[in-house]
């Protein structure tokens, strides 16, 4: 899977979209999880409604919401009041049984609020390192990782 980068401004909302084949994933609930480390597990943040037919209803966990357009095949995640600690690697998932298929890998970047004059030193961006496989550029509020970028900062 390519990793798509979504950039948001601290304090504002960021909307992440994950397109998928609506027939292939028919009847399956979806989830948004956060990758813990480069090879670690993906920790569930929020999942769609327990009844798939009600997947269009927005579900919240803290400041993160999820809603699924099951006919159009688009999963949408909203991160409200984006904070520096929200930066990192995530996945959109399709659930079947206890297993999950990755729909999209997402790197969330948090940009400094241009109206906020506090020190932006604690804002996190991916570090420079070896090339990231299958990278391609996709401009808008999102892009895929550029070659040379990695989704986790170097461990020193």
């Amino acid at each position: 899977h390519n990793t798509t980068v979504f950039q948001g401004v601290a304090g504002q909302s960021l909307q992440v979209s994950c397109p998928y084949d609506s027939m292939k994933h028919w009847g399956r609930r979806k989830a948004w999880c956060r990758q813990l480390g480069e090879k670690g597990p993906c920790q569930r943040v929020v999942s769609t409604h327990n009844l798939w037919l009600l997947s269009f209803l927005r579900r919240w966990n803290g400041s993160t919401a999820i809603t699924d357009d099951t006919l159009g095949g688009t999963l949408t995640i909203t991160l409200r009041n984006l904070q520096p600690h929200d930066a990192g690697l995530y996945q959109c998932q399709s659930l079947h049984g206890s297993e999950a298929d990755t729909l999209r890998k997402v790197l969330v970047e948090v940009l400094a609020d241009p109206l906020d004059h506090r020190d932006a030193g604690d804002l996190w961006f991916p570090g420079e390192s070896e090339s990231f496989e299958d990278a391609h550029v996709e401009h808008s509020i999102s892009r895929s990782l550029l070659e040379g970028e990695i989704p986790f900062p170097p461990t020193s």
Epitope: D21, M23, K24, W26, W52, L53, H96, G97, S98
Partner: antibody, heavy 123, light 107 residues
């Protein structure tokens, strides 16, 4: 009416190759996963793997990975199971089955089955 | 892989009897379980999915229950056409696995 029709019985020698088929009709073939299941003589059912004809996404059981190849041609609504070099231990009945996701619980079950293809491998 | 163990491996009963077959998973599978019926020389037929949901067209004398690791298939009043082999199957994770089967014979 949903139907899965499999190719006829085969008698082969060890080392030979073989490709059996499963043709779907009465539904949108490209939109449902198709599984292959083995049943050795007098034995139980073994899940071999599954394919989504829409994009040919395949998952194999570790027990069958590298032993068989599962493929599909959505243009003719047909799934395939093939061997490059048969062994006597491949003698079995092979079933294809449509995998349907039930939205009640977001998992999938085999709601329609082919009639089976008997493969006999003997020198 | 998740192991599925059925018991008994065979059972003899008469028409009109109530029969219960059990299936145990080696780890919790929530309610992701199916039951199939297979007659000699035929393909399996889906009876129950999601542990307790009756497949369309299946007689109401068949019922399923259980969750986690222990499941049961009950036939409330055996009919002549019910004598067959029954398999459970977990739909929790890949690879999908089946129980070894329970053969239901005429007493």
């Amino acid at each position: 009416e949903v139907q899965l029709v499999q190719s006829g019985a085969e008698v082969k020698k060890p080392g030979e190759s073989l490709k059996i088929s499963c043709k779907g009709s009465g539904y949108s073939f490209r939109s449902y996963w198709i599984a292959w299941v083995r049943q050795m003589p007098g034995k139980g059912l073994e899940w071999m793997g599954i394919i989504y004809p829409g994009d040919s996404d395949v998952r194999y059981s570790p027990d069958f990975q590298g032993q068989v190849t599962i493929s599909a041609d959505k243009s003719i609504s047909t799934a395939y199971l093939q061997w490059s070099s048969l062994k006597a231990s491949d003698t079995a009945m092979y079933f294809c089955a449509r995998s349907r996701t039930f939205y009640y619980d977001s998992s999938d079950y085999f709601d329609y089955w082919g009639q089976g293809t008997l493969v006999t491998v003997s020198s | 892989d998740i192991q599925m163990t059925q018991s008994p491996s065979s059972v003899s009963a008469s028409v009109g009897d109530r029969v219960t077959i059990t299936c145990r998973a080696s780890q919790g599978i929530s309610s992701w379980l199916a039951w199939y019926q297979q007659k000699p020389g035929k393909a399996p037929k889906l009876l129950i999915y999601a542990a307790s949901s009756l497949q369309w067209g299946v007689p109401s004398r068949f019922s399923g229950s259980g969750s986690g690791t222990d499941f049961t298939l009950t036939i409330s009043s055996l009919q002549p056409e019910d004598f067959a082999t029954y398999f459970c199957q977990q739909a929790d994770s890949f690879p999908r696995t089946f129980g070894q089967g329970t053969k239901l014979e005429i007493k």
